[in-house]
Interface confidence: low
């Protein structure tokens, strides 16, 4: 006769491992007992269990509650056992020793491999600001056995770097994603993808990029100079910018206080019916937590009773 087993049995951490050992004997042969032992223990073989044809299953105190026979129906020639709730420390060499009648003893070895699926974590880097050089956007760490694969899935242009730390029974892999922040990256997903033989599918953790920026400010409303004349109603100036975080707007007049009746409504400056008193230099101040910008315009209200033309100057400053 001969023993049928597997060279390697692979299970995921926490699963039950079936350690196969089947004696394929000739007609009339019987299995008296099957002994299972750890074959790689430092101080010789350590017994797990012994299946006896008459007295049943005996389990070593070190494995109490963890070693069982497979559920019925059972073949009397089958010496397989179940090792419940496999842990990393279970990984190693196991030996099955079968005592048969009348053929004698047989033994076989197998290796138990316990996969430890990673639990990845994604840590965002420092706050991203437009104008920075190459900056850490996020790092992703996954520890498992064997070492997991950590990659990135994103449409954002960047560079990755990985490092691995080996422990006694596992390995931790950290991958960093660096980029040069730009406003176009705002709201873009950056996904850490972790692959491992112990996972049914890749694990993905997504981080949404936030890049602080503030665009140049400009003022609209003076495009048609002929509209800025005494008596005109509904005249307004609008300050244009964009940013992350969204900016706030403030209007001032450089050459004095805002004339009475002029309304400030966020980015818009609304005028009452125009008079020559509304002529002056108006400044839009745009700011967010990242930066601030100014844009100033000169308003010259044309009095039809005067012959002088109207001049309009636009100046933008940061």
């Amino acid at each position: 006769g001969e023993l049928e087993t597997s060279d390697v049995v692979t299970v995921v951490l926490g699963q039950d491992a079936k350690l196969p050992c089947f004696y394929r004997g000739d007609s009339g042969e019987q299995v008296g007992q099957v002994a299972w032992a750890r074959a790689d223990a430092g101080e010789g073989a350590q017994e797990l269990a012994l299946l006896h044809s008459k007295y049943g299953l005996h389990v070593s105190p070190a494995y109490e509650g963890r070693v069982e026979q497979p559920p019925p129906p059972r073949n009397p020639l089958d010496g397989s056992v179940l090792l419940r709730n496999a842990v990393q420390a279970d990984e190693g060499e196991y030996e099955c020793r079968v005592s048969t009648f009348p053929a004698g003893s047989f033994q076989a070895r197998l290796r138990l491999r316990v996969l430890v699926p990673p639990l990845p974590s994604l840590n965002p880097g420092p706050a991203l600001e437009e104008g920075q050089g190459l900056t850490l956007a996020a790092s992703c760490t996954a520890e498992g056995s064997p070492a997991p694969s950590v990659t990135w899935d994103t449409e954002v242009k960047g560079t990755t770097s990985s490092r691995s730390f080996k422990h006694s029974r596992s390995a931790a892999v950290t991958s960093e994603f660096h980029l040069v922040p730009s406003r176009s990256m705002n709201g873009q997903p950056l996904t850490c993808v972790v692959s491992h033989p112990g996972l049914l599918q890749d694990q993905r953790i997504t981080h949404i990029l936030h890049v602080s920026f503030l665009a140049e400010a400009s003022v609209r409303g003076l495009e048609d100079q002929n509209l800025w004349h005494v008596g005109r109603e509904g005249a307004m100036l609008k300050c244009l910018s964009e940013g992350q975080p969204p900016p706030s707007y403030n209007w001032t007049r450089l050459d004095g206080p805002l004339p009475s009746g002029v309304r400030v409504d966020g980015d818009t400056l609304g005028f009452p019916p125009l008079t020559t008193e509304h002529s002056g230099i108006y400044v839009c101040h745009v700011s967010n937590e990242f930066s601030s910008r100014d844009s100033q315009v000169t308003v010259d209200v044309l009095d039809p009773q005067e012959d002088s033309g109207k001049q309009v100057d636009l100046v933008s400053a940061s």
Epitope: L119, S121, T141, E143, Q201, Q203, R204, I205
Partner: nanobody
């Protein structure tokens, strides 16, 4: 479904200390990352600190050196020790936990108020 319950918030003078706790209901799956965010009145929720099952930590620059995050994996509990508190630390502090099964799922607590008076 994982339930997160924060405690330990309150009123404290500037320079004082508080310790927040967040207990997660038991889950048959291990919680991957746990941590804290906060939201001050009129502001967006902001990251404070996180800790992995292995004990690796990360902090926002604004709290680094003053706040310490720790974790009891056996009890699925995360703590935030807050020292040298400033008025700008005033916010509702939210606990967060991520469960990794075949993909990550993030859970949030209801928050605990921390008020730092000057």
């Amino acid at each position: 479904e994982v339930q997160l319950v924060e405690s330990g918030g309150g009123l404290v003078q500037a320079g004082g200390s508080l310790r927040l706790s967040c207990a997660a209901s038991r889950s048959t799956f291990s919680l991957n990352i746990m941590g804290w965010y906060r939201q001050a009145p009129g502001k967006q929720r902001e990251y404070v600190a996180t800790i992995t099952t292995g004990g690796s930590t990360n902090y926002a620059d604004s709290v680094r050196g003053r706040f310490t995050i720790s974790r009891d994996n056996a009890e699925d509990t995360v703590y935030l020790q807050m020292n040298s508190l400033k008025p700008e630390d005033t916010a509702v502090y939210y606990c967060t936990a991520e469960l990794v099964r075949r993909g990550p799922t993030t859970y949030w607590g209801r928050g605990t108020q921390v008020t730092v008076s000057s």
